[in-house]
Interface confidence: medium
């Protein structure tokens, strides 16, 4: 299963399968995921270690037990890959590091006026992998300014120093925010020249263009096919480089495919995983365990459930089958690639499904619609549960906001229907960041089913909760993801670090603002709450949140979006945005629906529509 | 490596008062709740309540409120459970813990009340 | 509250016996269990968890199963080190809730 605790002051001894530098454990645990065999990971942060060399050190494990012996280490970090981890998989890491400089090969100096624009430059072009910034008050005048775009043979600096007054961070192509755009094509019968940076086997193109996008250096690829003339060269899957970004040459050739990586990609990425079955074919590698199962969808289950499995045999030969049962033959290597494939067997093989993102991991005015005052833009992916509600009549505009929980399941608030209870004239729009994005082109939901709470009452703020049913499921990407549902009872108050968001007036007397945008807003005990609004009952089942003075809160346009708690370590949805009277008054705060007092009920109408529980729960 | 050192051990008389710390190590004190749990041989382990250092904000079994306080002092990394009105029901094993997600996963070495005339 | 109630509340078993401490509460708690090996004189050590599974570096010999209201922690070959009482826990509703204990020995 996922396992995401992390052991601090940890260290696990032994297993080593390799070794880098990160900035920190988190960028450490991304690479521990990305690995084929890695299991476990220790990182070494500045403070914990005197070694110089040692210093961010992240040494990635594996264990056939799944787990190692802990010792301790003060400072240190450990923890597990977040492989079978569903949504939480994801190469993208956002982060900018303050103090630190992170080394590499320097290819391309330039001045900018601050450290976003050098990340930016650095995700707009094609080799960047990190970068290094000296800002204004660097100890040397003429590095002022300076942005160094950076790579390296493996993706992750050759080493990482302290440096006062330098600013570091990754390129931000892998959470799809690339300007650079990409090649879907697949060119037939063309190899591409330059430099190899690896070489694997993969039953199609698919997989070598997969593969290529996740590979730290890979920017095109060739591909030599099943009936390639020269026997060892089949199903050959060559990663390339070059100088410039793009295959210095091409040539026509019989049997090889060619295209290039996904990675700069904008907005959509491939899954990190291979899914299709190939029937037919034989996948060699070193043999984990084999197991009798029926049929071989069942076969690729117990492979991705087994979170060594790396690939998996189904073998229809009559010695290998058992009534309906046959074998299931468990494979792993050290690439994560099958060591030898073989067509025209009676087997059928595929791919472990562990690095998938869409996993359901069960282990994210006066009382009339309530914007966010006094925030600030959000970035792309920093709430992907977030989504739009929009109305279409004679126009489409925004009515309120809703937070995805599950592939099919939407949270809001019951308000947002009031007189307008049509499913079909809804259209909900997850995965963006600006209003102004949206076209008529732009994907959206449509709604199979609204579940406004039984006891809700129009004009009355009393169980402002609704669930959306989603006419089809959506997949999770690194915009479009659900947010964690508090347990049942959970008591606000002990809730810090929380956050609304939503698209919703800016001011009273605002209008809909098209960035998405997010406030820190503290939560107010109810007995505070009720002072504040002496004409309404503040029931148990809903919680505030504002400032004393006023100036941060939702508006009109944010009803049925999210208040977001980091609660021990994970983002559990609190509250949906209700009401309030007026906006960000002084002693007025916004009035929430409380999730977790609403919990029976979700999972209730959630497993009872479709015989199975498909909300978020906290993993 | 996460640590909770408790304070040690209380022979009370009945209607004291008792003050038991919890020294927090190894993590961000003000991000994580501090639960404690209280054990005796007959009704065995009993969820007293939580104390988020980061807010000040709590939570309270109803059976424990106004038998239980929390507090918790930021700068030296403490939390306390101070238990009043002492009977000889009171006399157990409280322990400070500390979750990852909502499971405990962290936890004091105890520490043993006795409520004795 | 949410009653938890396991058994059996004391067993003994021979080192290598497949050893089974069932865990029911009094209504669904949606998979929120939590189990914990505590062993004389020690505090509590939380083994599984319904959210991430098996902790780590608890012996692979640990599993957790069941759904709904009723729960199983399973010792698939008992060892002398596993001498100690076991307690589940629902994190479901507050407030959280304990079973009884079941004391396991070696015969």
């Known amino acids: 299963g996922c396992l995401t605790q992390l052991y601090e002051n940890a260290f696990f001894r032994g297993g080593d399968v390799a070794s880098m530098y990160t900035p920190n454990a988190q960028y450490c645990q991304m690479r521990c995921t990305f690995h084929p065999r890695c299991l476990l990971f220790s990182f070494l942060p500045a403070s914990s270690i005197n070694d110089m060399e040692k210093r961010f050190g992240c040494f990635l494990k594996d264990s056939v037990t799944g787990t190692l012996p802990k010792v301790h280490r003060t400072g240190a970090v450990s923890g597990h890959s977040l492989k079978q981890c569903g949504h939480q998989i994801s190469a993208c890491h956002r982060d900018i590091y303050k103090g630190v400089d992170m080394r590499g090969v320097n290819f391309n100096v330039s001045k900018v006026s601050s450290v976003e624009e050098c990340q930016k430059r650095c995700t707009s072009n094609i080799r960047c992998q990190f970068f290094s910034y000296a800002t204004q008050t660097f100890h040397k005048a003429e590095y002022r300014n300076n942005c160094l775009l950076k790579y390296s043979p493996g993706g992750t600096p050759t080493a990482i120093k302290v440096l006062s007054n330098v600013e570091s961070g990754f390129s931000l192509k892998p959470c799809a925010l690339s300007e650079i755009g990409c090649h879907m094509n697949i060119f037939q019968h063309l190899a591409f020249s330059d430099v190899d940076v690896a070489r694997v086997l993969t039953p199609d193109a698919f997989v070598c263009r997969t593969i290529c996008t996740y590979h730290p250096n890979c920017l095109f690829f060739t591909f030599y096919t099943n009936v390639w003339k020269i026997e060892s060269q089949r199903n050959v899957c060559l990663l390339k480089t070059s100088e410039s970004g793009t295959p210095s040459s091409s040539t026509p050739q019989e049997n090889t495919i060619s295209g290039y990586s996904l990675l700069t990609c904008k907005r959509t990425l491939p899954e990190p995983c291979h899914s299709k079955i190939y029937p037919g074919v034989d996948f060699g590698g070193e043999e984990l365990n084999v197991t009798f199962v029926k049929g071989v969808n069942v076969c690729q289950e117990t492979c991705t459930k087994m979170i060594r499995c790396q690939f998996f045999t189904y073998s229809l030969l009559p010695e290998d089958c058992k009534e309906e049962k046959c074998k299931c033959f468990l494979r792993l290597s050290m690439d994560g690639s099958p060591t030898r494939i073989a067509y025209g067997t009676q087997g059928s093989s595929g791919y472990s499904l562990r690095l998938c993102n869409t996993g359901d991991n069960s282990v994210c005015t006066t009382k009339t619609s309530t914007r966010i005052v006094g925030g600030t833009n959000s970035s792309w992916g920093e709430w992907p549960w977030q989504v739009s509600l929009q109305v279409k009549l004679t126009a489409q505009r925004h009515l309120c906001g809703g937070s995805l929980i599950g592939h099919q399941w939407v949270l809001t608030a019951a308000h947002c229907f009031d007189g307008l209870p049509l499913q079909d004239v809804w259209r909900i729009y997850s995965g963006i960041l600006n209003l102004s994005d949206i076209t008529k082109d732009t994907p959206f939901s449509q709604i199979k089913e609204i579940i406004i709470h039984q006891n809700y009452k129009v004009s009355e703020g009393n169980h402002d909760i609704a669930l959306i049913k989603l006419q089809a499921p959506l997949n999770y990407t690194e915009f479009q993801k659900p947010i964690c549902l508090p347990s049942k009872g959970d008591t606000s108050t002990i809730y810090t670090n929380c956050w609304v968001t939503g698209w919703g007036f800016s001011k009273e007397k605002g209008e809909i603002q098209n960035i998405l945008q997010k406030v820190n807003i503290p939560l107010v005990t109810n007995e505070e709450c009720q002072k504040r609004y002496q004409d309404y009952k503040i029931t148990q089942r809903m919680v505030c949140a504002g400032y004393k003075e006023g100036g941060k809160d939702a508006c009109k346009g944010d009803s049925g979006g999210p208040l977001v708690c980091k609660h021990n370590g994970m983002w559990r949805l609190v509250g949906i945005t209700s009401w309030g009277e007026g906006c960000a008054r002084r002693e007025q705060p916004g009035v929430y629906t409380k999730v977790a007092e609403y919990m029976d009920w979700i999972l209730e109408k959630t497993q009872s529509s479709d015989g199975k529980a498909q909300m978020q729960s906290p993993a | 490596q996460v640590q909770l050192q408790q304070s040690g051990a209380e022979l009370m008389r009945p209607g004291a008062s008792v003050k038991v710390s919890c020294k927090a190590l190894g993590y961000t004190f003000t991000d994580y709740e501090m639960h404690w749990v209280k054990q005796t041989p007959v009704l065995g382990l009993e969820w007293i309540g939580a104390?988020?250092?980061?807010?000040?904000?709590?939570a309270y079994n109803q059976k424990f409120k106004g038998k239980a306080i929390f507090t918790a002092d930021k700068s030296s990394r403490t939390a306390y459970m101070y238990l009043s009105s002492l009977t000889s029901e009171d006399s157990a094993v409280y322990y400070c813990?500390?979750?990852?997600?909502?499971?405990?996963?962290?936890w004091g070495q105890g520490t043993l009340v006795t409520v004795s005339a | 509250d949410i009653q938890m109630t396991q058994s059996p509340s004391s067993l003994s078993a021979s080192v290598g016996d497949r050893v089974t401490i069932t865990c029911k509460a009094s209504?669904?708690?949606?998979?929120?269990l939590a189990w914990y090996q505590q062993k004389p004189g020690k505090a509590p050590k939380l083994l599984i968890s319904?959210?991430?599974g098996l902790e780590a570096g608890v012996p692979s010999r640990f599993s957790g199963s069941g759904s709904g209201t009723d729960f199983t922690l399973t010792i698939s070959s008992l060892q002398p080190e596993d001498v100690a009482t076991y307690y589940c826990q629902q994190y479901w509703s507050t407030p959280w809730t304990f079973g009884q204990g079941t004391k396991v020995e070696i015969k």
């Open positions: 209504e669904d708690i949606y998979n929120r």
């Open positions: 813990t500390r979750p990852y997600g909502y499971p405990f996963a962290y």
């Open positions: 319904g959210e991430t």
């Open positions: 104390i988020h250092p980061g807010s000040g904000g709590t």
